[in-house]
Amino acid sequence: TIPPHVQKSVNNDMIVTDNNGAVKFPQLCKFCDVRFSTCDNQKSCMSNCSITSICEKPQEVCVAVWRKNDENITLETVCHDPKLPYHDFILEDAASPKCIMKEKKKPGETFFMCSCSSDECNDNIIFSEEYNTSNPDLLLVIFQ
């Protein structure tokens, strides 16, 4: 049961369930917005973001966006609602416990994005091919 004094705060808008009907709770994500990064040509990187923030809404997940152009590399870390596009892209992998980077087409830059739904999961961003979601073992991890 929901504790009584939470019911004022927990109206019908706030009670969010996943695909299995389990109640979703506000998540902790790294949240540094856009920062310069030294993450390049690596299988995985830590965000080096020292801010762990509680997401505003229970449905929000952690997101990381890695961008490289002629001048610099940046890493963006935020909370975001997967029902809404981010940088014009749908968050397809929001149910994943790990932040596995996927390349997106953006003119003039290299653009990777990942989303995930476990606490601080956007602290460790994974580029390695071995984590590609075509791997059936990973799908088991994500959806079990």
């Epitope: 705060s9 762990t52 509680i54 606490d119």
Partner: antibody, heavy 121, light 107 residues
Framework: QLQVQESGPGLVKPSETLSLTCTVS??????????WGWIRQPPGKGLEWIGS???????YYNPSLKSRATISIDTSKSQFSLKLSSVTAADTAVYYC?????????????WGQGTLVTVSS | EIVLTQSPATLSLSPGERATLSCRAS??????LAWYQQKPGQAPRLLIY???NRATGIPARFSGSGSGTDFTLTISSLEPEDFAVYYC?????????FGQGTKVEIK
């Protein structure tokens, strides 16, 4: 009515590991509607968050403890414990194992009475 | 981590008077601020969460306000049992942090 009770040795020697147990009665720690954790309060001072968890999610630790803290969970006994390694006099405090609603995680709506741990040789 | 600064450190008032306690955050904590009351030898007790919501069983004389970096706890008319130490706590950025406390003492 869910209640928590802290237990453990009142005296620990410097450089040793402090071990405390929190027993939950009147409910289950595997109820994910509630978050659990540890907070401490040095004598005459303010409160410090040590770490917290809710069932099915990883435990969050305060980075200031530099990996000295470990929280483990035994759902069969409805208990969770705190181990704090390499203690010094600065770790002398009343240790609480509070509970809060996960929907507003970080808010504490129920506290045990706390247990005083003194670090001294 | 976010630093919470409470003022004043001590507030000397008489029963029946109005108490106004302040909590200022080093950066925005949105509305994620709670207030706790602690009496000597006891654990803290939740009064207010998310800036202005009273916890179960808390009398209406306790009210909270504010958002961003500046918050206030008001006790409209002090009862004898209200003399205690009051802590604010933020949960916007983790770890959650507490202010150093304001002691409300009998004048």
């Amino acid at each position: 009515q869910l209640q928590v009770q802290e237990s453990g040795p009142g005296l620990v020697k410097p450089s040793e590991t402090l071990s405390l147990t929190c027993t939950v009665s009147g409910g289950s720690i595997s109820n994910s509607y509630f978050s659990w954790g540890w907070i401490r309060q040095p004598p005459g001072k303010g409160l410090e968050w040590i770490g917290s968890f809710y069932y099915g999610e990883k435990t969050y630790y305060n980075p200031s403890l530099k990996s000295r803290a470990t929280i483990s969970i035994d759902t069969s006994k409805s208990q969770f414990s705190l181990k704090l390694s390499s203690v010094t006099a600065a770790d002398t405090a009343v240790y609480y194992c509070p509970r809060g609603p996960t929907m507003i995680r970080g808010v504490i709506d129920s506290w045990g009475q706390g247990t005083l741990v003194t670090v001294s040789s | 981590e976010i630093v919470l600064t409470q003022s004043p450190a001590t507030l000397s008032l008489s029963p029946g008077e109005r108490a106004t306690l302040s909590c200022r955050a080093s950066q925005s904590v949105r509305s994620y601020l709670a207030w706790y009351q602690q009496k000597p030898g006891q654990a803290p007790r939740l009064l207010i969460y998310d800036a202005s919501n009273r916890a179960t069983g808390i009398p209406a004389r306790f009210s909270g306000s504010g958002s961003g970096t500046d918050f206030t706890l008001t006790i409209s008319s002090l009862e004898p049992e209200d003399f205690a130490v009051y802590y604010c706590q933020q949960r916007s950025n983790w770890p959650p942090t507490f202010g150093q406390g304001t002691k409300v003492e009998i004048k």
